[in-house]
């Protein structure tokens, strides 16, 4: 059974950094591209980033480009999101997800809340 | 970036009645593989999103056949033939044809009392 579990969220001051993790199990992690998607409180979904199955290719939303870095460790079946220069508008629940675009099933974690506040 | 515009933003529907949500993209969503990558998601209250439809009209396994997707180019529609209580939530379209991927603002489906 596919399982995605995010962790690392919390309260952080503006300008500071935070690293989110997503532990994957129940599937061949090394064969799948992985995404981060966020949702600000009471707001809609915003796609954040994708990383290719082997970590060779990454794309980001303009709002996080240059501040956030998506990475993965296939030996640990773990996806990461390194967030720096955090702003109040980065406050959101962050979800890791698999197969947003293609395939017959998509998978999402339960989300981890990041609050950027002084 | 490709702008995705959904309408309406709020949709009150009577149980058993049909519902229709529109999604317009600022650019064609035909990808280099020849497919149109327009995806629909449902997010029920307090839950993570889940994909309902991919490539405009392909239903994800396990999604009831009352959900259907249609459209081409820049105009797309999600239809629910007979709304049920469990369909309450927010519906989002997503384009997966151009970087960065972008979501629509969401359409909140509510049941009319």
């Amino acid at each position: 059974q596919v399982h995605l579990v995010e962790s690392g969220g919390g309260v952080v001051q503006p300008g500071r950094s935070l690293r989110l993790s997503c532990a994957a199990s129940g599937f061949k992690f090394r064969s799948y591209g992985m995404h981060w998607v966020r949702q600000a409180p009471g707001k809609g979904l915003e796609w954040v980033a994708i990383i290719w199955y082997d970590g060779s290719k990454r794309y980001y939303a303009d709002s996080v480009k240059g501040r956030f870095t998506i990475s993965r460790d296939n030996s640990k079946n773990t996806l990461y999101l390194q967030m720096s220069s955090l702003r109040a508008e980065d406050t959101a629940v962050y979800y890791c997800a698999r197969d947003l675009i293609t395939g017959t099933t998509d998978y999402w974690g339960q989300g981890t809340l990041v609050t950027v506040s002084s | 970036d490709v702008v995705m515009t959904q309408s309406p933003l709020s949709l009150p529907v009577t149980l058993g009645q049909p519902a229709s949500i529109s999604c317009r993209s600022s650019r064609s969503l035909v990808y280099s593989d020849g497919n149109t990558h327009l995806i629909w998601f449902q997010q029920r209250p307090g839950q993570s999103p889940r994909r309902l439809i991919y490539r405009v009209s392909n239903r994800v396994s396990g999604v009831p056949d009352r959900f259907s997707g249609s459209g081409s180019g820049t105009d797309f529609t999600l239809k629910i033939s007979r709304v049920e209580a469990e369909d309450v939530g927010v519906y989002y379209c997503l384009q997966g044809a151009h970087w960065p991927y972008t979501f629509g603002q969401g359409t909140k489906l509510e049941i009319k009392r």
Epitope: V2, F27, K28, R30, S31, Y32, G33, M34, I50, I51, W52, Y53, D54, G55, S56, K57, N74, D99, I101, T102, G103, T104, T105, Y107 | D33, S61, G96
Partner: antibody, heavy 123, light 111 residues
Framework: DVKLVDSGGGLVKPGGSLKLSCAAS????????MSWVRQTPEKRLEWVAT????????YYPDSVKGRFTISRDNAKNTLYLQMGSLKSEDTAMYYC????????????????WGQGTSVTVSS | DIVLTQSPASLAVSLGQRATISCKAS??????????MNWYQQKPGQPPKLLIY???NLESGIPARFSGSGSGTDFTLNIHPVEEEDAATYYC?????????FGGGTKLEIK
Amino acid sequence: DVKLVDSGGGLVKPGGSLKLSCAASGFTFSNYGMSWVRQTPEKRLEWVATISSGGYYTYYPDSVKGRFTISRDNAKNTLYLQMGSLKSEDTAMYYCSRDREGFGNYLGAMDYWGQGTSVTVSS
Amino acid sequence: DIVLTQSPASLAVSLGQRATISCKASQSVDYDGNGYMNWYQQKPGQPPKLLIYAASNLESGIPARFSGSGSGTDFTLNIHPVEEEDAATYYCQQSNEDPYTFGGGTKLEIK
């Protein structure tokens, strides 16, 4: 236009070595995983090796593991297959192929192939 | 290793008719609801050409008369209506599990 040109094949004695090359053009080479597939004289297709787009990961079937090495030079847009301890059963047409992009996923489907280079292992 | 058995080994079909090629896997090639089965066409003196990926997805530029279906261990390639240029050998390939294996091929002749 995507183009893959295989070279380096030839006649080699059992136990010998050979290095195949595949020159790629018409696409961003560093964005794609690449594979080698061979076709035996009986027309049977066999997957030989795969290398991920960045070159971080390599995969082989047991039949060539430890004898063959796949590598790539993204600056030169070139894929390689170093073959060692060659056996008569390695005689085949060797094709380099591009792995189909799957929105970040590894699909294992090969969407473009070179014209092939023939390898004959014989004493 | 997963063994792929194609049938028939050869078939002759009249122009405009349907050609159906079967590929049976010795174990399931599905993963998370996705069928990791691909289909290729090979003409004499040419390399293989991808037709269908992930069981049912038509590769870009391939005519819609080609279609793939199936799941688990049973997969099918259909060509309808068959045209003269479809005379070739067709191979299935699974990419669910290392080593990625091919079927033995099906030779299609046009009557």
